[in-house]
């Protein structure tokens, strides 16, 4: 959401979020690292092109023209400098002048050594318990952001991992239309549209960066779960990894796993939608997970096949009209899982990414809650790996990513909600090894053609 330094009455009233980097001569003397040429405080650029007509409530949602409902001035960093005050480097760069390349490797969780697996699980648990050093979350909408007295900013601290959960919740929540009115649910700033892959890519990149800083370990990388096994078992659901099934309750995680101790955030949907409040940092019940356990829906009791990935990578158009969850021959809609793996839309189909979520049959299968199950991270790194392979094969052809008339939040130049500093979909539509400082250690299945007899 916003840097702690900007969650103040002064910043919110002025609309300026341009924190100092090294203010030697007092507050406001080094906004955006301007004294060392790193950046400067400028007007926010926000996409104002039209969105599709399925969202009819313009003017009612803080996420419109993000982030202008809150701030209209922010840091614009020069060269490879980056961050809320231009104090860090763009992904893939390091050094005092941000002029040295770095490349981290995201690997298959199952290929890690025992020590590496243990380190990853411990790191996730640390992220769940560690207050985010930079960001705070809003607990009220913009009209109530200064509190009942108009002088008390309504923000809370939140842990690094719960921030990851909260940003996802905020991007998918319904539009509140007022007390006594039903909230509008046909809106989603991170799913069912072209921004699905770019949004989740940045989401992971932010968590990875936060965990690198938390650990002081620049090489730290998020592993992936290759969920395209075609199996009806969760191969990473073991106590040394993401937690096996509890013997006492088949919908819970084994007490031998640290994840059995995790408590979820953003579970009070009824309050948010009827009272107009936002999810806060309060933790609730445990993670629920019952892999392959949805007997009422046999089609989600088995994971995608390896060939599904090979097939989806042959869909050459990134997206197609109406740029929604009913698009046909759209790579994005195919990997998201609303089309079958060949790209054909079918309302009954749930494949690839969607199928992996639904297979988990619990917290991880509910959109507003899903990141509470840390398997979400691994599921999405694999989805991002598929995206990156598509970008490599098709030379990051952005021509079918619409500039306008996509669902709200999904236009090419839209600032992804609710990330800070503002970052557009375009910035994430690039090959990761050359542009974002990470690569995947992965072998892709080749398409097998059956020869007719």
């Amino acid at each position: 959401q916003f840097p702690r330094q900007c969650a103040t009455v002064e910043a919110l009233r002025s609309g300026m979020c341009c924190p100092d980097l090294s203010p030697v001569s007092g507050p406001g003397t080094d906004r955006c690292g301007s004294s060392s040429g790193r950046g400067r405080c400028e007007a926010v650029t926000a996409d104002s092109r039209p969105h599709s007509p399925q969202y009819p409530h313009d003017g009612r949602d803080d996420r419109e023209v993000w982030p202008l409902r809150f701030f209209n001035r922010t840091c614009h960093c020069n060269g490879n400098f980056s961050g809320h005050n231009c104090g860090t480097c763009r992904p893939g760069w390091r050094g005092a002048a941000c002029d040295q390349r770095v490349l981290i490797v995201r690997r298959n969780l199952l290929d890690l050594s025992k020590e590496e697996k243990n380190h990853f699980v411990r790191a996730l648990d640390m992220a769940k318990r560690t207050t985010h050093p930079l960001f705070v979350i809003a607990t009220r909408r913009s009209e109530e952001i200064l509190g009942p007295d108009g002088n008390t900013p309504q923000f809370e601290n939140i842990s690094i991992y719960n921030y990851f959960v909260w940003t996802h919740y905020y991007s998918v929540k319904k539009t509140f239309l007022g007390v006594g009115q039903e909230s509008f649910g046909e809106v989603d700033f991170s799913h069912e549209g072209p921004a699905f892959l770019t949004w989740h890519r940045y989401h992971l990149l932010r968590l990875e960066k936060d965990m690198q800083e938390m650990l002081q370990e620049p090489s730290f990388s998020l592993p992936y779960w290759n969920f395209a096994t075609g199996k009806n078992v969760c191969d990473i659901c073991t106590d040394d990894l993401m937690g096996s099934r509890s013997n006492f309750d088949s919908t819970l995680i084994s007490p031998n796993s640290v994840f059995s101790q995790w408590r979820v955030v953003c579970d009070s949907l009824e309050d948010y939608d009827t009272l107009g409040t936002l999810c806060n940092s309060t933790e609730d019940g445990p993670i629920r997970r019952n892999p392959a356990g949805n007997v009422a829906r046999p089609m989600v009791q088995r994971l995608p096949e390896p060939q599904d990935v090979a097939q989806c990578l042959e869909v050459g158009l990134f997206d197609t009209p109406p740029f929604y969850s009913n698009s046909t021959n759209s790579f994005r809609n195919t990997v998201e899982g609303y089309s079958d793996p060949t790209g054909k839309y079918d309302p009954a189909v749930r494949s690839l990414h969607n199928l992996a979520h639904l297979f988990l049959n619990g917290t991880g299968g509910q959109t507003h809650l899903s990141p509470n199950d840390p398997i979400f991270v691994l599921l999405h790194t694999f989805t991002d790996a598929v995206f990156d392979e598509w970008l490599r094969r098709y030379n990051a052809d952005i021509s079918t990513f619409p500039l306008e008339n996509a669902p709200i939040g999904h236009n090419r130049q839209y600032n992804m909600v609710p990330f800070w500093p503002p970052v557009t979909n375009t910035e994430m539509f690039v090959t990761a090894p050359d542009n974002l400082g990470y690569t995947y250690e992965i072998q892709w299945p080749s398409r097998e053609f059956s020869v007719p007899e």
Partner: antibody, heavy 121, light 106 residues
């Protein structure tokens, strides 16, 4: 002036535990990560782990996991290293040292004078 | 990441130039520091980020390298340069040290 003042030498029995202290001055420990390093007699340097005094987070080299425990008291600007299940192999000088919170800077820039721990019957 | 440091020891005369090298088992992207330790004293930072001289360190010390290969060069040796030298990486946990180089001034 930045200083890291470590506690005095310790003579301990095998199997016992010892708690070493490192009192800092001249900087706010909440802005730094405090690391500990071991040096056995006539040997090189071995990294033990770090603590973030601001939140109590710790990371250890796997070979010290379970035997070393780092804690911090921000009110007194002091960090502690507790060693348990001591053997003669743990006879060494133990240094506390600091690293800038900006993890981009690869260095331990100030060091304590070291505490000698001797494990003997 | 393992750090291989060489030579284990060397001897040189005042005014000469010596080079100590550290090889990492993987790319550490310049996340490397060099320290000097005199007998019975604490280590002292010389170089960070592979090539940036720490405050107060004489300019006869210089760090270089990239990827997996790094070196510390000491030109116009002085008698006070005798001691042990260590490299340490900060790329991935644990942050291991090199085995050390003992420098003797003839």
């Amino acid at each position: 002036e930045v200083q890291l003042q470590q506690s005095g030498a310790e003579l301990v029995r095998p199997g016992a535990l010892v708690k070493l202290s490192c009192k800092t001055s001249g900087f706010n420990i909440k802005d730094y990560f405090l690391h500990w390093v071991r040096q056995r007699p006539d040997q090189g340097l071995e990294w033990i782990g770090w603590i973030n005094p601001d939140n109590g987070n710790t990371v250890y080299d796997p070979k010290f996991q379970g035997t070393a425990s780092l804690t911090a008291d921000t009110s007194s600007n002091t960090v502690y290293l507790q060693l348990s299940g001591l053997t003669s192999e743990d006879t060494a000088v133990y240094f506390c040292t600091r690293r800038d919170y900006t993890y981009e800077k690869a260095a331990l820039d100030y060091w304590g004078q070291g505490t000698t721990v001797t494990v003997s019957t | 990441i393992q750090m291989s440091q060489s030579p284990a020891s060397l001897s040189a005369s005042v005014g000469e130039t010596v080079t100590i090298t550290c090889r990492a088992s993987g790319n550490i992207y310049n996340y490397l520091a060099w320290y000097q330790q005199k007998q019975g004293k604490s280590p002292h930072l010389l170089v960070y980020d592979a090539k940036t001289l720490a405050d107060g360190v004489p300019s006869r010390f210089s760090g270089s390298g990239s990827g997996t290969q790094y070196s510390l060069k000491i030109s116009s040796l002085q008698t006070e340069d005798s001691g042990n030298y260590y490299c340490q990486h900060f790329w991935s946990l644990p942050f291991t040290f090199g085995s050390g180089t003992k420098l003797e001034i003839k």
